[in-house]
Amino acid sequence: APTSSSTKKTQLQLEHLLLDLQMILNGINNYKNPKLTRMLTFKFYMPKKATELKHLQCLEEELKPLEEVLNLAQSKNFHLRPRDLISNINVIVLELKGSETTFMCEYADETATIVEFLNRWITFCQSIISTLT
């Protein structure tokens, strides 16, 4: 059974994951650049189901494409580069989903824009956090 300290750690990791996903989404939504239109043409795979930490496998598999799309903003001066954000997200995802069980991600038939994709995973984090508090 999970201890209160392990639950606290999971909650903190989910909060950090949530904050960085929101940071990326805000950056895209605020983007005062024609490249935003191009960013929205890229399609992302969405999970068929995302209700448990093991489903973060579906997010992990889309992190490389996410970084590539964010790199379109290369003309900007970054405080944090896309690779810094994606690297941190990857570390958190690996810790949260664990490596002891191999989970095959199932994707929905419909693909999504980067905004829809980020919103889906933001909702996932918020939902899991609410079950822990």
Partner: nanobody
Framework: EVQLVESGGGLVQPGGSLRLSCAAS????????MGWYRQAPGKQRELVAA???????NYADSVKGRFTISRDNAKNTVYLQMNSLKPEDTAVYYC?????????????WGQGTQVTVSS
């Protein structure tokens, strides 16, 4: 409006250490980037290190392995632990608060704190 108050600068010998702190107050959003930039005389302002509220970090190549950035989200405070300081680290260090991961006209800057590395 966001106010930034820096502290911890000073004179230190080469090889020494300093810890800079910067507390943000005012209209703070939970999603933000805080960090440190520096400007040496006659040079352009450059990134030293930055950290998001989610813990993502970015370091200038010149400080990797010597400087560590950290933050306390509850206190809206960012810290820069500077070890193995070199004369070329001498500069005015500016605290920065941003609501996005890229530079924007809405970024806020502190007044700066002088760091001098000299024997």
């Amino acid at each position: 409006e966001v106010q930034l108050v820096e502290s911890g600068g000073g004179l230190v010998q080469p090889g020494g250490s300093l810890r800079l702190s910067c507390a943000a107050s005012g209209s703070i959003f939970s999603i933000n980037v805080m960090g440190w930039y520096r400007q040496a005389p006659g040079k352009q302002r450059e990134l030293v290190a930055a950290i998001s509220s989610g813990g993502s970090t970015n370091y200038a190549d010149s400080v990797k392995g010597r400087f560590t950035i950290s933050r306390d989200n509850a206190k809206n405070t960012v810290y820069l632990q500077m070890n193995s300081l070199k004369p070329e680290d001498t500069a005015v260090y500016y605290c920065m608060y941003a609501s996005s991961f890229y530079e924007d006209e809405t970024d806020y800057w502190g007044q700066g704190t002088q760091v001098t590395v000299s024997s």
